[in-house]
């Protein structure tokens, strides 16, 4: 119904009031629910109302506003500290202990986060974004520095329709249009061979507990799995001779693990020769990402941090040990 310039929606009635004509919903059941568009952000609950905008939001602290879009900083709370002596004793031993897997405990001293003690170091959001990996969009964390809110603001739940087929045909130099989508990893760039590469700055250096021959054999699956987490494409970097940069890794000799030496009895020097895994150098190619998304990594720093964040959540499907982002062309060092 309408009266004058006011057009009312389905199920609404027009009521003449002192301040002019207004739309009114006599029975919210019969009207389009204002809640249909999920207007309440940050976990706020939506309640249908009889008058425009036909909803009201009940916000969860620390949010407020008509759509729970406003963040209200709580009175300054002291930063959480890692109180547990247990966690102090267990930090940096190479084993992730969930009781210590918190921001305050530096993710068990990096043991749960691929040795990166603060993946959110560059995140300046007023929200503690590490606590907002919650399957809903938190715009205040939806920045590259805050790791794109774990991609929760752009349909993170989309899955590859023909996943098995697309995995088998990923990066096989044959374009499968059914796999040429973000959720299917853009068919490993098979459909973009004629497009110029768009490399992110830097290199991801990953230690994975798979010997080089096994990793190279499984390279397509490995690159697809990591690319899926980063919502872009990865490739193994080549050295100046054109060789793939995948090297044997002989185990951690850093101070972080001198704390707990390998306990098997071995001849001097023998332990160093045992291949524990691989050190692989990866590049990010955004040629498809930039066409479909504005959430692409311009450099490898935040990409490394996002992988660390996945390690914290326990959602990595490969036995990664560490990840670092190198800005300059690396020398081959072990």
């Amino acid at each position: 119904s309408s009266c004058g310039q006011v057009k009312c929606r389905k199920g609404e009635q027009c009521v003449h009031t002192a301040s002019g004509p207004r739309c009114f919903c006599p029975s919210p059941r019969d009207c389009e629910s204002g809640c249909a568009s999920s207007p309440c952000q940050h976990g706020g609950s939506c309640h249908p109302q009889r008058q425009p905008p036909y909803y009201s939001c009940q916000c969860a602290p620390p949010f407020s506003g008509s759509r729970c879009e406003l963040y209200t900083a709580p009175p300054s709370t002291p930063p959480a500290t890692c109180l547990s002596q247990y966690c102090a004793d267990k930090a940096r031993d190479g084993v992730c202990d969930e009781a210590c897997n918190s921001h305050a405990c530096q993710w068990d001293g990096g043991d749960c986060s691929l040795t990166m003690e603060n993946p959110w170091a560059n995140c300046s959001s007023p929200l503690p974004c590490w606590d907002y990996i919650n399957n809903q969009c938190d715009e205040l964390c939806n920045t590259v520095e805050c790791l794109f809110d774990n991609f929760e603001c752009q349909g993170n739940s989309k899955t590859c329709k023909y996943d098995k087929y697309c995995a088998d045909h990923f990066k096989d130099n044959h374009c499968d249009q059914g796999c040429n989508s973000e959720e299917c990893g853009w068919d490993g760039l098979d459909c973009a061979a004629d497009q110029p590469e768009n490399l992110a700055e830097g290199t991801l250096v990953i230690v994975v507990l798979m010997p080089p021959e096994q990793l190279l054999q499984d390279a397509r699956s490995f690159l697809r799995a990591l690319g899926t987490l980063l919502h872009t494409n990865l490739r193994i970097k080549r050295d100046s001779q054109g060789e793939l940069m995948v090297y044997p890794y002989y185990g951690e000799k850093s101070a972080a693990m001198k704390k707990q030496r390998m306990t098997r009895r071995s001849l001097p020097g023998e332990q160093e020769q045992e291949v524990a895994g691989s050190k692989v150098f990866l590049e990010i190619d955004n040629r498809q990402c930039v066409q479909d998304s504005d959430h692409c990594f311009k450099n490898t720093d935040a990409a490394a941090a996002l992988l660390a964040s996945h390690a914290i959540q326990g959602t990595l499907s490969y036995p990664l040990v560490s990840v670092v982002s190198e800005s300059l062309t690396p020398e081959r060092t072990q």
Epitope: G94, C96, D97, L209, T263, P319
Partner: antibody
Framework: EVQLVESGGGLVQPGGSLRLSCAAS????????MSWVRQAPGKGLEWVSY????????YYADSVKGRFTISADTSKNTAYLQMNSLRAEDTAVYYC???????????????WGQGTLVTVSS | DIQMTQSPSSLSASVGDRVTITCRAS??????LAWYQQKPGKAPKLLIY???SRASGVPSRFSGSGSGTDFTLTISSLQPEDFATYYC?????????FGQGTKVEIK
């Protein structure tokens, strides 16, 4: 097929020592944590110790700390439990069990060996 | 240390019955809980991890629920091969601890 096979159990006198072995096959031994779990006759399960073969990090139950030592030989894909100063209450079937979550002690044990019986008696 | 308390310690049931076993942790363990089945003379077998995820090859009649301190294992329709002892276990922090077990016997 992922498999764990324990050996080394037997009869030992109180105060004596024994070394149990757990041979792993069918997976990347270095990548996954390993625990020893024991079960006294007619009783429930008790976790004993954990090792992450890659880093060599170890964890122990208070009841065995200082007496038992867990270790791993990554070249042999074998975990060990060296048991010293054995007591009657250590009598149990000892199982080795693989953790499902790579470097996480905070993961379930998804593969178990068949167990080896240790009897401590004079 | 985190204590795990299972109830009941034993129960008698018939084939086709719905069986529920509960497990309570002395402090919050989020969803870091597993359920194991053990038959006499055999090693334990993982049934449920993460409080509610079924392990590979486990029949759909087994389900787990709960979070924090209270957890449940449900067998929707008891089969002859399900008569065994069931253990819950927390893996939130070391020392890893088990419940005392629930023996499911034939009525």
């Amino acid at each position: 097929e992922v498999q764990l096979v324990e050996s080394g159990g037997g009869l030992v006198q109180p105060g004596g020592s024994l070394r149990l072995s757990c041979a792993a096959s069918g997976y990347s031994f270095t990548s996954y944590g390993m625990s020893w779990v024991r079960q006294a006759p007619g009783k429930g399960l008790e976790w004993v110790s954990y090792i992450y073969p890659y880093s060599g990090a170890t964890y122990y139950a208070d009841s065995v700390k200082g007496r038992f030592t867990i270790s791993a030989d990554t070249s042999k894909n074998t975990a060990y439990l060296q048991m010293n100063s054995l007591r009657a209450e250590d009598t149990a079937v000892y199982y080795c069990a693989r953790h499902s979550g790579y470097y996480r002690i905070s993961s379930a044990m998804d593969v178990w060996g068949q167990g080896t019986l240790v009897t401590v008696s004079s | 240390d985190i204590q795990m308390t299972q109830s009941p310690s034993s129960l008698s049931a018939s084939v086709g019955d719905r069986v529920t076993i509960t497990c309570r942790a002395s402090q919050s363990i989020s969803s870091y809980l597993a359920w194991y089945q053990q038959k006499p003379g055999k090693a334990p077998k993982l049934l449920i991890y993460g409080a509610s995820s079924r392990a590979s090859g486990v029949p759909s009649r087994f389900s787990g629920s709960g979070s924090g301190t209270d957890f449940t294992l449900t067998i929707s329709s008891l089969q002859p091969e399900d008569f065994a002892t069931y253990y819950c276990q927390q893996y939130y922090s070391s020392p890893l601890t088990f419940g005392q077990g629930t023996k499911v016997e034939i009525k």
